[in-house]
Interface confidence: low
């Protein structure tokens, strides 16, 4: 009785065991053994197939078979079969087992392949706690990750198998902490159409850190009030808070802050001016007397109710420009003019502080001529020390 | 613990005011925002407004601008809050919250009892 | 201003089961997002602040999660206590606002 069978394989290799006796023998039944232990059973000459033989397959085996009569009792050779690893338990390393927050990592699963067997294909997936990272299986044993967050803290292992599946080996657990940086050195900054802030027009809050990793949580105050008024939790080193129409009320003192989990850090306060355009100005006219005559000195007051200083307003007769005056302090300003005749007709003014001009109504005036004579068909109407009515 | 105990339900004609109270215990007054909630019959949560109980600066909803006041006592550690020209829409259950400590953000982590306001001619 | 809208209105399940609540925003409100639970005849109680984080003392088959407009509350096996409506609320940056959805009621079957 001959047991035929290889005397060395590899992990993932069919065995077959083959147990040969001479034909004209008559059993009643047959057996394989391995270690003296009875491994399978049959009722007439077979063959025995491991599958896909595991490093546990090495060891001692041997045929028996059972006769119709005693003497027919036989065993065959015993072969010792040593199944030999195709790779090693892959190692998990990594660029960094510390990585800080915000920055890349490289995983690598690192395995060997039997010298005799360098032909064999290997795929890797990577793990991190129970979940697959990158795209699952692949040829390559290095996975980058382009950022790491504080929340990819954890266990991570790697597996690596034959690409025909017959054999999977997993590396140990290893643990990766990610260290998260402090923020440091918040800014506030505004930015605004033209550089200045300006009413009615938009405002950004522009919140930065130097600094820090991971989620940051932006928050912006008023100094005065004291109160938040947005807030912004995003992976980056500045947020923006849009004030879509700036209004007078919003002048103040502002301030910023910024915490992505350790000790929130606060900007220097900023003062915010809100520069007010020009309001459409009112043109009073004043003269000595209650007509308004040639020879006269006849007074131009021109005032914008609302607006940043300084207003330069500009007088104009019959779109003419007879003089400007400027109010560094906001206010009006005036204008003097001796009166001939003519002068008659429309007057008005121009207010103008660098965020736009606005002009006044018109204001039409008739001069009385030195013989008592008006100039023109209509009256202005002018008292002393009053506007001058329209004519 | 922390408490919040509002003041009794109250029944208002229309064109009234009512004024709810809210007393705190179980923690620094001053250090947290008490916001005010309502809730309608069968309808959601409608926030009102709230006061910065540190330094007394209020926010209100702009659907109750110029009808409702916020106001606080922080020697008798009480917040208050007072409806004008009530109509027989604003019969609701009224609630006083006080703004989490948790998260950056306005949630509310105690609330008040509530107090039903009736409004009926 | 920013409009929550919850479903579905009501979710019929039984103890032991999985429940999914969904909050859309009508525009990004970042994760500024918190879940409360109403008994009838009491107090909103605070579960979900900043999408999903738990508050103080909620037990942990409740978790949030979501960020931008869609947001998630899932109880991941319901106890009898747990049959109530459901808000999510939002406070959005400029103007400063909060508003509530129109609620979730999560009923026995």
């Known amino acids: 009785l001959t047991l035929v069978a290889p005397s060395s394989v590899f992990e993932g290799d069919s065995i077959v065991l083959k147990c040969q006796g001479e034909q004209n023998w008559k059993i009643q039944k047959m057996a394989y053994h391995k270690d003296n232990k009875e491994l399978s059973v049959f009722k007439k000459f077979s063959d025995f197939l491991i599958q896909s033989a595991v490093l546990s397959d090495s060891g001692n085996y041997f045929c028996s078979t059972k006769g119709q009569l005693f003497l027919w009792d036989k065993t065959s050779n015993i072969v010792k079969i040593k199944v030999q690893e195709l790779f090693q338990r892959p190692v998990l390393t990594a660029s960094s087992f510390q990585p800080i927050e915000g920055g890349p990592v490289s995983l690598k699963c690192e395995t060997r392949l039997s010298p005799q067997r360098l032909d064999v294909q290997l795929q890797f997936c990577f793990f991190r706690e129970n979940q697959v990272l990158g795209s699952g299986w692949s040829s390559s044993p290095e996975l980058q990750i382009s950022a790491v967050w504080s929340e990819d803290t954890g266990s991570y292992w790697c597996k690596a198998e034959t690409v025909t599946h017959r054999i999977r080996k997993q590396s140990l657990q290893s643990q990766i902490h990610v260290q998260r940086i402090p923020i440091s050195n918040v800014s506030l900054e505004i930015r605004a159409p033209g550089g200045q802030v300006t009413e009615g027009q938009k405002l950004i809050l522009l919140c930065s850190v130097a600094g820090g990793t991971g989620n940051v949580t932006f928050s912006w105050y008023r100094e005065a009030t004291g109160t938040s008024m947005g807030k912004k939790t995003q992976r980056s080193l500045s947020a923006e808070l849009e004030i879509p129409a700036v209004k007078e009320s919003d002048a103040g003192k502002y301030y910023c802050r910024a915490d992505n989990g350790h000790v929130p850090i606060q900007s220097k306060v900023v003062n915010i001016p809100v520069r007010i355009p020009v309001s459409r100005p009112v043109l009073t006219l004043r003269s000595p007397g209650a007509q308004a005559a040639v020879g006269d000195l006849l007074e131009l007051h021109c005032e914008a109710l609302r607006g940043s200083p300084p207003i330069l307003y500009q007088f104009y007769h019959e779109d003419v420009t007879l003089g400007n005056s400027s109010a560094p302090s906001g206010g009006g300003a005036s204008f003097n003019l001796s009166l001939t005749a003519e002068h008659s007709g429309n007057y008005s003014c121009e207010a103008n502080n660098g965020l736009g001009a606005q002009c006044s109504e018109a204001v039409p005036v008739s001069i009385s001529g030195p013989d008592g004579y008006r100039r023109d068909l209509m009256t202005a109407g002018v008292t002393e020390t009053s506007q001058v009515a329209p004519a | 613990q922390v408490q919040l105990v509002q003041s009794g339900a109250e029944v208002k004609k229309p064109g009234a005011s009512v004024k709810v109270s809210c007393k705190a215990s179980?923690?620094?007054?001053?250090?947290?925002?008490m916001h005010w909630v309502r809730q309608a019959p069968g309808q959601r949560l409608e926030w009102m407004g709230w006061?910065?109980?540190?330094?007394?600066?209020?926010r209100y909803s702009q659907k109750f601008q110029g009808r409702v006041t916020i106001t606080r006592d922080t020697s008798a550690s009480t917040a208050y809050m007072e409806l004008s020209s009530l109509r027989s829409e604003d019969t609701a259950v009224y609630y006083c919250?006080?703004?989490?400590?948790?998260?950056?953000?306005?949630?509310?982590?105690?609330w008040g009892q509530g107090t039903l306001v009736t409004v009926s001619s | 201003e920013i409009v929550l809208t919850q479903s579905p209105a009501t979710l019929s399940l039984s103890p032991g089961e999985r429940a999914t609540l969904s909050c859309r925003a009508s525009q990004s409100v970042s994760s500024y997002l918190a879940w409360y639970q109403q008994k009838p005849g009491q107090a909103p109680r605070l579960l979900i602040y900043?999408?999903?984080n738990r508050a103080t003392g909620i037990p942990a088959r409740f978790s949030g999660s979501g960020s931008g407009t869609d947001f998630t509350l899932t109880i991941s096996s319901l106890e009898p206590e747990d049959f109530a409506v459901y808000y999510c609320?939002?406070?959005?940056?400029?103007?400063?606002?909060?508003?509530f959805g129109g609620g979730t009621k999560v009923e026995i079957k």
């Open positions: 919250a006080r703004e989490g400590s948790n998260g950056w953000h306005e949630d509310f982590d105690y």
């Open positions: 006061i910065n109980v540190g330094n007394g600066n209020t």
């Open positions: 609320q939002q406070r959005s940056d400029w103007p400063p606002s909060l508003t």
């Open positions: 179980g923690y620094t007054f001053t250090s947290y925002a």
């Open positions: 900043d999408a999903s």
